[in-house]
């Protein structure tokens, strides 16, 4: 049997016997386009494809629609995997989304959505979420029903303002809503009363800008 050498996600990488955390090359079925993604092979059984990470403010997240489409940053550090890849991936089979959060006081929490997918670019990569559990709030900090994705050059929110310009970063803004994990990174002791920080309201409340965030996906049947 010929060994599989292309993997669509980190779950496939894990099942092939690669069980070490790190950056792997992923390729969608029937595609030659490759993306580099960080795979978490330890958390909750492993096989997680990291689609977003914030940890130190080293990467600028105030990017264009195209940059959020194709991805940017460093998969070993802060990065955005890319809306197009995630959209295609999550429309091929059912995925769960886990969002892991860290505050500046040493606390950690997570939100787990049992079904997650992004619509196509034609539908502005609208986010679809179902079935919230976890410790980062009983109510979803990503507005429900899901919104279209907005960036500084693509205003698809429900606000009379331009949320991406006001809050910075690309996100599924409402008007503007209870979260923005792609906001400005603020260091410790400068992270409260922020109008444009890294926000997850139903865990830390308004104006609190988080220390770290990771968004990761995995097939529901893993």
């Amino acid at each position: 049997k010929e060994e599989q050498i292309s993997f669509r996600d980190c779950a496939e990488v894990f099942k092939s016997g690669h069980t070490t955390n790190g950056v792997y090359t992923l390729t969608l079925p029937n595609s030659t386009e490759e993306v580099k993604a960080y795979c978490d092979m330890e958390a909750g059984g492993g096989g997680w494809t990291i689609i977003q990470r914030r940890e130190d403010g080293s990467v600028d997240f105030q990017r264009t629609w195209k940059e959020y489409k194709v991805g940017f940053g460093n998969p070993s550090g802060e990065y955005w995997l890319g809306n197009e890849f995630v959209s295609q991936l999550t429309n091929q089979q059912r995925y769960v989304l886990k969002i892991h959060l860290k505050d500046w006081e040493g606390n950690e929490a997570y939100s787990l959505y049992e079904h997650f997918y992004l619509s196509s670019e034609e539908l502005n990569y609208r986010i679809h979420l179902k079935g919230l559990t976890g410790t980062a709030g009983k109510i979803s900090s990503i507005s429900q029903p899901g919104n279209d994705f907005s960036t500084k050059d693509a205003d698809n929110d429900k606000c009379i303002c331009k949320c991406s310009q006001m809050l910075t970063g690309g996100w599924w803004f409402d008007a503007c809503g209870p979260s923005n994990l792609n906001g400005m990174y603020y260091p410790q002791r400068q992270n409260t009363n922020k109008f444009n920080g890294i926000k997850w309201y139903y865990w830390k409340g308004s104006g609190y800008s988080l220390k770290g965030t990771t968004m990761m996906i995995r097939p529901a049947d893993f």
Epitope: C159, C161, A175, G197
Partner: nanobody
Framework: EVQLVESGGGLVQPGGSLRLSCAAS????????IGWFRQAPGKEREGVSS????????YYADSVKGRFTISRDNSKNTVYLQMNSLRPEDTAVYYC??????????????????????WGQGTLVTVSS
């Protein structure tokens, strides 16, 4: 650094009055809507009153309508809450909070709680005889 500081709380008898102040620093009130909220022991934080940024229009919770008045003095970068005919059920910690102008859904007039990103530390109001 954005800061909101409330003052004016204290102990007052039922039927009495208090005037709360919310002094802002690190930003100018002209570009923000300001809300007053309160939280009684063991209860959720609730909106009391707010004043819009652009036209100065005001909102009041049903429980305080006709008794409380919100106003702003942009030259002093301060918002006030005049509270008259106070009742024991008005006892709570009162907070002021700010939200940038225009962070509103099309067709809506008032801001949800989660849009207020800057908060003061609160001032305690106790209504008791």
């Amino acid at each position: 650094e954005v800061q909101l500081v409330e003052s004016g709380g204290g102990l007052v008898q039922p039927g009495g009055s208090l005037r709360l102040s919310c002094a802002a620093s690190g930003f100018t009130l002209d570009d923000y809507a300001i809300g007053w909220f309160r939280q009684a022991p063991g209860k959720e934080r609730e909106g009391v009153s707010s004043i819009r940024d652009n036209d100065g229009s005001t909102y009041y919770a049903d429980s305080v309508k006709g008794r409380f008045t919100i106003s702003r003095d942009n030259s002093k970068n301060t918002v006030y809450l005049q509270m008259n005919s106070l009742r024991p059920e008005d006892t709570a910690v009162y907070y002021c909070a700010a939200v940038p102008a225009g962070r509103l859904r099309f067709g809506e007039q008032w801001y949800p709680l989660y849009e207020y990103d800057a908060w003061g530390q609160g001032t305690l109001v106790t209504v008791s005889s």
